[in-house]
């Protein structure tokens, strides 16, 4: 199970895949209908980044996309890979780094207003590798346009924070990305150790509200690194 990877204050280290060598990049195997989980069930918390299993592009960080680490690899074995820079080859928009999109197999720059459609109007259904397309990339489901006219309420599925009503942000909540409340003073928050790690969590918290920052709680300064509690505090 994914229990021990759910600590949202940790970077994750995958075990080798089933039958794989210890030095091989970690990968995911399909363990149950619609759910991806690692080849073994032991995760360790480490400071250096390791590959993260995924079923959808949206489960990866903003500078990553979800694909098989080997060409022509099994569709069930997918991890988050670094996005492709401008002029690099691509197969779909999500492969290109932010500010670019895939045109005629090449990542090209997108001007701000021109390209809002395909990526933003779709959302994935988490763990959905039971609906993979022929090219091995998970099927996307288009959200009803109704959702884009009405701002999402707490708990409703979303693609980005602008889909959510005021005071809410769009964050992963195990099974999907949903609108959650922006954190208030004193609430537990997540301090990210590396840029982009927010996209790697299966449970995400929103950011701290205006005038607040995520800092170590004073009475937790003596605690060990792994158990330090961060809360939203006044600047």
């Amino acid at each position: 199970t994914l229990n021990s990877v759910l600590n949202s204050n940790a970077i994750k280290n995958l075990p080798p895949p089933l039958g794989g060598a210890a030095g091989h990049p970690g990968s995911a195997v399909s363990a149950a209908p619609g759910i991806l989980y690692p080849g073994g069930n032991k995760y360790q918390t480490i400071d250096n980044y390791q590959p993260y299993p995924c079923a959808e592009d949206e489960e990866c960080g903003t500078d990553e996309y979800c694909a098989s680490p080997t060409r022509g690899g099994d569709a069930g074995v997918q991890i988050c890979l670094a996005c492709r820079k401008r002029r690099k080859r691509c197969m779909r928009h999500a492969m290109c780094c932010p500010g670019n999109y895939c045109k005629n197999g090449i990542c090209v720059s997108s001007d701000q207003n021109h390209f809002r459609g395909e990526i933003e109007e779709t959302i994935t259904e988490s763990f959905g590798n039971d609906h993979s397309t022929l090219d091995g990339y998970s099927r996307r489901t288009t959200l009803s346009s109704k959702m884009y006219h009405t701002k999402g309420q707490e708990g409703s599925v979303c693609l980005r924070s602008s889909d959510c009503a005021s005071g809410l942000c769009c964050a992963r909540h195990f099974w999907s990305k949903i609108c959650k409340p922006v954190l208030k003073e004193g609430q537990v928050c997540t301090k990210h150790r590396r840029k982009g790690s927010h996209g790697l969590e299966i449970f995400q918290r929103c950011y701290c509200g205006e005038g607040l920052s995520c800092r170590i709680q004073k009475d937790h300064h003596q605690a060990s690194n792994s158990s330090r509690l961060h809360t939203c505090q006044r600047h």
Epitope: T1, V5, L6, N7
Partner: antibody, heavy 116, light 110 residues
Framework: QVQLVESGGGLVQPGGSLRLSCAAS????????MSWVRQAPGKGLEWVSG????????HYADSVKGRFTISRDNSKNTLYLQMNSLRAEDTAVYYC?????????WGQGTLVTVSS | DIALTQPASVSGSPGQSITISCTGT?????????VSWYQQHPGKAPKLMIH???NRPSGVSNRFSGSKSGNTASLTISGLQAEDEADYYC??????????FGGGTKLTVL
Amino acid sequence: QVQLVESGGGLVQPGGSLRLSCAASGFTFSSYWMSWVRQAPGKGLEWVSGISYSGSNTHYADSVKGRFTISRDNSKNTLYLQMNSLRAEDTAVYYCARMGIDLDYWGQGTLVTVSS
Amino acid sequence: DIALTQPASVSGSPGQSITISCTGTSSDVGGFNYVSWYQQHPGKAPKLMIHDGSNRPSGVSNRFSGSKSGNTASLTISGLQAEDEADYYCQTWDSLSFFVFGGGTKLTVL
């Protein structure tokens, strides 16, 4: 306000079938995952099944896998649970619940009794 | 399988504070910060009281608070009132069984 109303419970013999329904109102049904949770008489809560907002992803507890099927009709704002090959141990109050931030709204439940 | 252990019963007098514990293995409650609490009055549906360990949904009294230390999550009810008498369930999440509940704790207000 959010409202969930279950129906379809009743007395059924072991091996029999039953279909539960849950009518949802007061929120955009098609924007939420939904679940069924059950509670045997005098016992604790047990998650049974969950379904994604469009219905293309479904998940089940091991105890009901292969016997129960969860589905939804977003045009009718209704969640369903088709229960086949029922056993005595399936006797419980069945709740439908919205998967917002966790199980944030629940119906009042419908009693399913499996007995000969 | 994940198991969350709760005391079968706790009791307290009106105005007092009580704490209900929920202990899990290191791979569930202790392995991450996510625990929720539900209240269930006899013959009624459960109600979400706490999510993400310590956050109250709107409409829930601030007399209810949650915390976590190591492998144990706790629900504290301060200024105990007669209407708090109910069953309380902790819940965590598992990738295969989604929602996992503790066995429940019966709170009696003396």
